[in-house]
């Protein structure tokens, strides 16, 4: 099976890489813009330069290409927490990202959020923070994994899962409770 | 089928309280991020809140950072929206969805939730 084609594919597949076909005049192939710049006007004919103009300030194109306009610079988004790692140039956006012992959970394909790194208090790191992924703790005994952070097994309620976890320490508690002296 | 049932919704004066909860189904909700959005009368949709599938990570709007607590329980595939403090800006329609950011899949039908004194 054939993949189906945009139009705009179709009509650079006759051309050359490096070169897409003038959209008024199907028989001549123009010269792509390099990156960090864009079309300002097509060929005017075979063998001749396209007008190809440099992004202005705010904008950027990050491959060759035939766009008539740049395209905006990203802004790091601040209510998420995110910082700049690297400011936008003619020929690349802006690259964000998190603080050190931070990480980050994506909501979607292109938003993340940045969240502190658990510290595994009370309890050891069994997988260390990572760029997309937060710490993996494991609990000392007498403690329980709740959402990333070890608790105590005395704030372990009975409808709770953490119950097998602190079995032992339920029972004890049990256990003193009903051991009366005679 | 993805099924989504907000329920809780109502008339509460401002400064009140409401709990609203989400049913779901027709997927493995433990599995996706989850969100609250609303709309009020006459405006355009607002990402209220969202949180992970493991409930470790939140997402709070400004306009209702430290009034609202989003919560899941997993083990009864529900979504909650603790919201306190209500205000009479806080009136919308609020949805529950599937998805966060700007990739909501699914919607449900939406609970009114009324803030006048």
């Known amino acids: 099976l054939v993949p189906h084609l945009g139009d705009r594919e179709k009509r650079d597949s006759v051309c050359p890489q490096g070169k897409y076909i003038h959209p008024q005049n199907n028989s001549i192939c123009c010269t792509k813009c390099h990156k960090g710049t864009y079309l300002y006007n097509d060929c005017p004919g075979p063998g001749q330069d396209t007008d190809c103009r440099e992004c202005e300030s705010g904008s950027f194109t990050a491959s060759e290409n035939h766009l008539r306009h740049c395209l905006s610079c990203s802004k790091c988004r601040k209510e998420m927490g995110q910082v700049e790692i690297s400011s936008c140039t003619v020929d690349r956006d802006t690259v964000c990202g998190c603080r050190k012992n931070q990480y980050r959970h994506y909501w979607s394909e292109n938003l993340f959020q940045c969240f502190n790194c658990s510290l595994c208090l009370n309890g050891t790191v069994h997988l260390s923070c990572q760029e997309k992924q937060n710490t993996v703790c494991t609990c000392h005994a007498g403690f329980f994994l709740r959402e990333n952070e070890c608790v105590s097994c005395s704030n372990c309620k009975k409808s709770l899962e953490c119950t097998k976890l602190c079995l032992p320490q339920i029972e004890n508690v049990k256990g003193t409770e009903d051991s009366g002296t005679t | 089928e993805v099924q989504l049932l907000e329920s809780g919704g109502g008339l509460v004066q401002p400064g009140g309280s409401l709990r609203l909860s989400c049913a779901a189904s027709g997927f493995t909700f433990s599995a996706y991020n989850m969100s609250w959005v609303r709309q009020a009368p006459g405006k355009g949709l607002e990402w209220v809140s969202a949180i992970s599938p493991s409930g470790n990570e939140t997402y709070y709007a400004d306009s209702v950072k430290g009034r609202f607590t989003i919560s899941r329980d997993n083990s009864k595939n529900t979504l909650y929206l603790q919201m306190n403090s209500l205000r009479a800006e806080d009136t919308a329609v609020y949805y529950c969805?599937?998805?966060?950011?700007?990739?909501?899949?699914?919607w449900g039908q939406g609970t009114l939730v009324t803030v006048s004194s």
């Open positions: 969805a599937k998805g966060a950011g700007e990739a909501f899949d699914y």
